[in-house]
Amino acid sequence: PEPPTACREKQYLINSQCCSLCQPGQKLVSDCTEFTETECLPCGESEFLDTWNRETHCHQHKYCDPNLGLRVQQKGTSETDTICTCEEGWHCTSEACESCVLHRSCSPGFGVKQIATGVSDTICEPCPVGFFSNVSSAFEKCHPWTSCETKDLVVQQAGTNKTDVVCGPQDRLRA
């Protein structure tokens, strides 16, 4: 028969014959022959291959370097890489999460719209009228101004986006 020029899925062409690729988690040791199938062996400890392949070496699992603020989110297997995330209070600088930076704090006048996660930074928003934030924080939202009326008080000093209103007693002297 004519030697093949193309092979089925999960096969590769070598020496005019189709050999099976190695399954995820295994590496190629020897191509198939007319007598035996492809020889594959498992990846070692701390190694992986995540596709059907003909790689002669497995890839090393990613190292989550604590010196860069990283920790293991999901331990790697022979078929998957380790997934790193950042320590509490830090987030990844890229999708690959190769290093971490401290979560951003929202300055006075700004509140936290979305709290940071291991992979995304804090999202701040300006405090709208009627709300304020007087601290620099990675967690605090804008707080509503105090309602003097509900306390039977009057506004003595108007609030800003950074300060609360100041309430005082009602002036009882009437003209």
Epitope: I14, V29, S30, T33, F35, L41, E45
Partner: antibody
Framework: QVQLVQSGAEVKKPGSSVKVSCKAS????????ISWVRQAPGQGLEWMGM????????SYAQKFQGRVTMTRDTSTSTVYMELSSLRPEDTAVYYC????????WGQGTLVTVSS | QSALTQPPSASGSPGQSVTISCTGT?????????VSWYQQHPGNAPKLIIY???KRPSGIPDRFSASKSGNTASLTVSGLQADDEADYYC??????????FGGGTKLTVL
């Protein structure tokens, strides 16, 4: 069909080294590992280690670590096994074979260590 | 790692079946489906007769079969023939790019 042809018999003095060659033909040289196995007279098979010709990476059995070196020459499709600090008990037939599975074998090389 | 354990000898009459065992540990035979069996006639290089625990290379008759249970692999030669008289060795992948052989079994056809 892969064929493995080994170098000829050797007689060595204790303390010296021996280098056995294994020339591959047929198939793609870089696409299979080569294991080395020895067999002392009247004894069983003993795996010594392997070399991956595609990258030249090696793995040696603990017993031979520090005494064995496996290399390859891709230009001649040949792998070599060198054993140093030879002793009389290293007298054996040394075989090369394809892969860990060892589905094809060389004809063997008799190494005699004697003073 | 230490050698796999095989009985030193086994025997059977022509036409009978003989089973040879190969006992390892949970780090080699028990851990991987990468057990091979070899036949070696005197003065010859070994010949692969079983790989990946139970597969036969093409050209090897189906009188040779193999299996594994736990840390023990077995080779069965059925319909024994005079030419089956030889030494038989098992080997197993032992992880970390290491391989270990059994001590060998001398099969005699009575």
């Amino acid at each position: 069909q892969v064929q493995l042809v080994q170098s000829g018999a050797e007689v060595k003095k204790p303390g010296s080294s021996v280098k056995v060659s294994c020339k591959a033909s047929g198939g793609t040289f870089s696409s299979y590992a080569i294991s080395w196995v020895r067999q002392a007279p009247g004894q069983g098979l003993e795996w010594m280690g392997m070399i991956n010709p595609s990258g030249g990476t090696t793995s040696y059995a603990q017993k031979f670590q520090g005494r064995v070196t496996m290399t390859r020459d891709t230009s001649t499709s040949t792998v070599y096994m060198e054993l140093s600090s030879l002793r009389p008990e290293d007298t054996a037939v040394y075989y090369c074979a394809r892969g860990f599975r060892m589905d094809q074998w060389g004809q063997g090389t008799l190494v005699t260590v004697s003073s | 790692q230490s050698a796999l354990t095989q009985p030193p000898s086994a025997s059977g009459s022509p036409g009978q079946s003989v089973t040879i065992s190969c006992t390892g540990t949970s780090s080699d035979v028990g851990a991987y489906n990468f057990v091979s069996w070899y036949q070696q006639h005197p003065g010859n290089a070994p010949k692969l007769i079983i790989y990946d625990t139970r597969k036969r290379p093409s050209g090897i008759p189906d009188r040779f079969s193999a299996s594994k249970s736990g840390n023990t692999a077995s080779l069965t030669v059925s319909g024994l023939q005079a030419d089956d008289e030889a030494d038989y060795y098992c080997s197993s992948y032992a992880g970390n790019n290491n391989l270990v052989f059994g001590g060998g079994t001398k099969l005699t056809v009575l």
